[in-house]
Amino acid sequence: EEELQVIQPEKSVSVAAGDSATLNCTVSSLIPVGPIQWFRGAGPGRELIYNLKEGHFPRVTPVSDPTKRNNMDFSIRISNITPADAGTYYCVKFRKGSPDVELKSGAGTELSVRAKPSAPVVSGPAVRATAEHTVSFTCESHGFSPRDITLKWFKNGNELSDVQTNVDPAGKSVSYSIRSTARVVLTRRDVHSQVICEVAHVTLQGDPLRGTANLSEAIRVPPFLEVTQQSMRADNQVNVTCQVTKFYPQRLQLTWLENGNVSRTEMASALPENKDGTYNWTSWLLVNVSAHRDDVKLTCQVEHDGQPAVNKSFSVKVSAHPKEQGSNTAAENTGTNERNIY
C-alpha cells in the first residue's frame, strides 16, 4: 500500500492585511482515516489553527466541502488577515485514535502579510532655532509588512541627505516600524518652507504616504532694529521712529525708555505679513525737547519670542535744536543691535 502523502504545494503565500488567505493542502489517500489539522509553527509550542472534526474556528473555512465523498482537499481559507497571522502553517494528518496520533505533516506554507504603513507623523524640534542653526525633524510610521520600505525627506521639493533611518525590529516580526531623523540647516527665508517625509512600500501601489511639517514651527527670525529721528516740529517735539523688521514669529514686545525710564510698552498684533512670511513693525515716540535741559537718551527695547531683549539706543541733542529750528537732523546712534542671543 502506497504511503500517504500530505502535499502543501505553495512554499509561501503573501496576502494583504484585511484580505483572506488560502492555504492549500491535499492528501494522497483517504487511508488511514483520521483528521487533518492545521497548525501555525512546529514543535510543542505550535498553535492549532483548524481542526475539521473538533472545535469551532470562526475565521477558518474549508475551501472544499469536507463532507464530500472521497474528499482529499483540506485547503483552508482564513478571513480578515492581520500581521499577527504571519507564520508558517502546517497541514498535519492524524490517524484516528484515542487520542489521535500524528502521522504526517506537509512541508509548510509561509504566510506573509502585506500591511500598509501608518500615515507618517513628522515632529519638529521642541524649541525654535535661528538661521544658520541645524534642527532635527523626526518621521515615524508603524505596522507595515514586509520589512522593505523606502523613506525620503524633502525640503521645498529638494531631497535632503543628512538623514538617519532605522527600521525595527531588526529580526523577523509580524510588523515593522520606521523612524527617521533629518537634519535641516535653517535660513532666514524658511518661514514658508516645508519638510516632507515620504514613505514608499509595496502595499501602497506606487502612491507613497506623506507627512509634513512647516519650518514656521521651528524657526525664529530675530528682528533688525533701526531708530531714526524725524525733523523738529514747530511745537518743539521730535518724532523718533523704531523700525523693527524681518522678524518671525509675530510675538514681540517693544518698550521705549527715556534716559533709562520706561516711557511706553507695546505688543505687536495683527501685523501684515511680508512675502517671506516675516513681519515688520514701526513704533513712534514724540519727545518734547523743551522739557529737557540735557540731551535725551532714547532706547528702543525689543523682546522677541521670549528671547533676551535687543536694544537700540539713540541720543537726542537738545543743544542742537534751537526752539525755532524745524530742520530734519540725523540722530546719533549709540545703541547696538544685539541679535542671535540664546
Partner: antibody, heavy 121, light 111 residues
Framework: EVKLEESGGGLMQPGGSMKLSCVAS????????MNWVRQSPEKGLEWVAE??????????HYAESVKGRFTISRDDSKSSVYLQMNNLRAEDTGIYYC????????????WGQGTTLTVSS | DIVLTQSPASLAVSLGQRATISCRAS??????????MYWYQQKPGQPPKLLIY???NLESGVPARFSGSGSGTDFTLNIHPVEEEDAATYYC?????????FGGGTKLEIK
C-alpha cells in the same frame, strides 16, 4: 470520552407518535453527521435516517420504509439529535441506536446503548 | 437498494484457529479506488462495535488478529487466531450509496 445517550422509547399503539432523543458528549457534535439505526430479530440491523451538517443545510436522508413518517432533526446548541416517529407500525418495533458518522461515509464509529420501542395493540 | 448477503449464518471455530466470514454485495460498493465496506462485532446486550473500515483498515483500538479484504462485491472478514472473547455476531455494512444496508449477520461460536 465520546458518549451517546438515547431516550424516549417505550410501548406505543399502532398509529401513535413518539419522539426519540439522543444527547451527545465528548466531541464537537456540530461537526458530525448523525444517524439512527434500528435492530429487530425479524429485520436485523436497519439504517433509518441520517442528518448532515449546517454547512450541508442539515440535509436529511431516510430509509424507504420510514419516509414520510419519520423526521430526523438536530439541535447543535444542545448537542442533540432527534427522531420524530408518526403513524407507528408494528414493524417499527426494535432497539433504536443513535450513531455518530465519523468520516461522512456511514463510518459508524460510536453507537449509543439504544432505546427500545415496542409498537403493539 | 444494495443487498448484502453474509455467509455462513453461523460458524464454530476452535480457539486459536481462523474464522472466515464472507459478505457479498448485490452491486459494487467500490468507487474511486475505495471499497465502502465496514465490519462490526456485536455481543449480546451491547451495540455493534466497528472493527474494519473501507474493507481492509483496522479501526483504532481493534486487535490486529482482525483483518478485512476484498473489493467490488466480495468481501471477507478474517479472525486469526480466534480467542474466546471473539464469540459474537458479526455484520458487514456498506456505504456505497444510499440507503446504507447491513448484512444479516454471522454468529461465531468458539469451540
Amino acid at each position: 470520552e465520546v458518549k451517546l445517550e438515547e431516550s424516549g422509547g417505550g410501548l406505543m399503539q399502532p398509529g401513535g407518535s413518539m419522539k426519540l432523543s439522543c444527547v451527545a458528549s465528548g466531541f464537537t457534535f456540530s461537526n458530525y453527521w448523525m444517524n439512527w439505526v434500528r435492530q429487530s430479530p425479524e429485520k436485523g440491523l436497519e439504517w433509518v435516517a441520517e442528518i448532515r451538517l449546517k454547512s450541508n443545510n442539515y440535509a436529511t436522508h431516510y430509509a424507504e420504509s420510514v419516509k414520510g413518517r419519520f423526521t430526523i432533526s438536530r439541535d447543535d446548541s444542545k448537542s442533540s439529535v432527534y427522531l420524530q416517529m408518526n403513524n407507528l407500525r408494528a414493524e417499527d418495533t426494535g432497539i433504536y441506536y443513535c450513531i455518530r458518522d465519523y468520516d461522512y461515509d456511514a463510518y459508524f464509529d460510536y453507537w449509543g446503548q439504544g432505546t427500545t420501542l415496542t409498537v403493539s395493540s | 437498494d444494495i443487498v448484502l448477503t453474509q455467509s455462513p449464518a453461523s460458524l464454530a471455530v476452535s480457539l486459536g484457529q481462523r474464522a472466515t466470514i464472507s459478505c457479498r454485495a448485490s452491486k459494487s460498493v467500490s468507487t474511486s479506488g475505495y471499497n465502502y465496506m465496514y465490519w462490526y462485532q456485536q455481543k449480546p446486550g451491547q451495540p455493534p462495535k466497528l472493527l474494519i473500515y473501507l474493507a481492509s483498515n483496522l479501526e483504532s483500538g481493534v486487535p490486529a488478529r482482525f483483518s478485512g479484504s476484498g473489493s467490488g462485491t466480495d468481501f471477507t472478514l478474517n479472525i486469526h487466531p480466534v480467542e474466546e472473547e471473539d464469540a459474537a455476531t458479526y455484520y458487514c455494512q456498506h456505504s456505497g450509496e444510499l440507503p446504507y444496508t447491513f448484512g444479516g449477520g454471522t454468529k461465531l461460536e468458539i469451540k
